[in-house]
Interface confidence: low
């Protein structure tokens, strides 16, 4: 439970671009693996994941949220890194890729971190942002979804992510928690909410609400590790449960709704 | 300043069950892991168990595992340890300590199951 | 279970090191305390926290560092009323671990 950069090189999760160190080669994105079992499953999966520009290490199906029904929460860790950081650097891991919960029940965003030098009271940071679009509404319009890829490609950067790199002044943007050495503290806007920063950096929820759905960035800041990237992020997305969702994921079965 | 008293222990009988309580004051209390520690007559410290902030994350010790239930009240800023099946071996003086690398101890309260 | 010396001693003044190893990285990084116990049964007092950190009441004299897995203790200018045993404590992926205490002399 103690409190808990990225590799140069690589992508980072503020949407900065690449910074490469000389020393340090491009790093191969993860690639995708399907999961779903049927046409539209797989239909639903392609227009969500294609999105994710490789960062997903899993599929998943969506269904339009109703408002008043049962939810999911679909939770889709990305990795901003997947190299090892030069001397004297953070490297943060956000792993896990994909997490599947019920609303109102609790979720980790799992994050780690390495430092190359003595750990001297890094400061854990994890902040919210609010997608740059509408993922949800893109996943089922394919014509969008086709023309977004289409325009990545063109424009030679398959590892643009829509959904996450605009600039802060277009979006919410909140710091949920901090920890430095043994305290945690929560950002005035999660002021009674159970959540807490566990494990070296994980952030956890006791219970997830609609409003939780955006973008959160683990960022570990250090005096003494001042190279690389010290940032990875996490999708969280509440989305509606309705009878679609059993197609769309086939063998999910949703436990009982707790207030 | 920082105070952490424990409470409960005293004697106890092989396979009851004891409730120890530390009321914690000073400090922002649900911004901190708490933990547990013992140490027996004569031997040295060992962690019992430990809960986070906000108590959703526990853990315990391979010694007490299956047999402790850790809990905090934020609003009391109080934390509890429920031992069952008391053994032999669970004598000694019980510690709440406060942050995961430890950076506040109680004065601790004596356990003697006999 | 974490490995320090049994005892060490030193006259008033003098530079003291002891050394602690052992530990399991915990999610890629250590952490350790360190404990002082002036006598048995007696409330341990933390000298050093988060591998270096001194609580604000606890003299300049100590001072915490780490090596790898390696964590050191150092009290420099040591003095009479520092004999204790000290124990050193680490976080680990299954929990909290202790080592069995140093006897300090002086």
């Known amino acids: 439970m103690q409190q808990d950069g990225l590799g140069v090189g690589t992508r980072n999760g503020s949407g900065k671009g690449r910074s490469v160190h000389p020393s340090w080669p491009w790093c191969a994105p993860r690639p995708l693996r399907y999961f779903g079992r049927d046409a539209r499953a797989r239909r639903a999966q392609t227009a969500a994941m294609a999105l994710l520009a490789g960062g997903l290490s899993r599929g998943l199906g969506s269904h339009p949220a109703a408002a008043g029904r049962d939810a999911v929460v679909f939770v889709w860790l990305l990795l901003s890194t997947w190299c090892t950081a030069p001397a004297r650097a953070i490297q943060v891991t956000v792993s896990n890729p994909y997490h599947v919960v019920i609303l109102f029940q609790p979720v980790t965003l799992p994050c780690t971190y390495q430092m190359t030098s003595t750990p001297t009271q890094p400061i854990v940071i994890w902040k919210y942002k609010s997608f740059c679009r509408d993922r949800i509404a893109d996943a089922f319009s394919p014509a969008s979804v086709d023309n977004q890829l289409n325009a990545q490609l063109a424009a030679g950067n398959p590892g643009y992510n829509p959904y996450v790199e605009c600039q802060d002044s277009v979006r919410t943007v909140r710091v949920v928690a901090t920890k430095q050495g043994n305290a945690v503290t929560l950002g005035d806007y999660y002021q009674g909410r159970r959540i807490t920063i566990t494990g070296n950096a994980d952030l956890t929820f006791d219970q997830t609400a609609w409003g939780d759905s955006g973008v959160y960035y683990c960022s570990v800041v250090s005096a003494q590790d001042l190279q690389g990237n010290n940032e990875a992020y996490a999708e969280l997305i509440v989305l509606g449960r309705t009878s679609g969702v059993a197609e769309l994921l086939p063998g999910f079965q949703a436990g009982p709704i707790e207030d | 300043a920082v105070t952490l008293d424990e409470s409960g222990g005293g004697l106890q009988t092989p396979g009851g069950a004891l409730s120890l309580v530390c009321k914690a004051s000073g400090f922002d209390f649900s911004s901190y892991e708490m933990q547990w520690v013992r140490q027996a007559p004569g031997k040295g410290l060992e962690w019992v168990t430990g809960?986070?902030?906000?108590?959703?994350?526990?853990r315990y010790g391979s010694a007490v595992k299956g047999r402790a239930t850790i809990s905090r009240d934020n609003g009391q800023s109080t934390v509890r340890l429920q031992l069952n099946n008391l053994r032999a071996e669970d004598t000694g003086t019980y510690y709440c300590?406060?942050?995961?690398?430890?950076?506040?101890w109680g004065h601790g309260t004596e356990v003697t199951v006999s | 279970a974490l490995t320090q010396p049994a005892s060490v001693s030193a006259n008033p003044g003098e530079t003291v090191k002891i050394t602690c190893s052992g530990g399991s990285s915990y999610a890629g990084s250590y952490y350790y305390g360190w404990y002082q116990q002036k006598s048995p049964g007696s409330a341990p007092v933390t000298v050093i926290?988060?591998?270096?950190q001194r609580p604000s009441d606890i003299p300049s004299r100590f001072s915490g560092s780490t090596s790898g897995s390696t964590a050191t203790l150092t009290i420099t200018g040591v003095q009479v009323e520092d004999e204790a045993v000290y124990i050193c404590g680490t976080y680990e992926d299954s929990g909290g671990v202790f080592g069995a205490g140093t006897t300090l002399t002086v």
């Open positions: 926290y988060y591998n270096d």
């Open positions: 300590a406060r942050g995961s690398t430890i950076d506040a």
């Open positions: 809960i986070s902030g906000s108590g959703s994350s526990t």
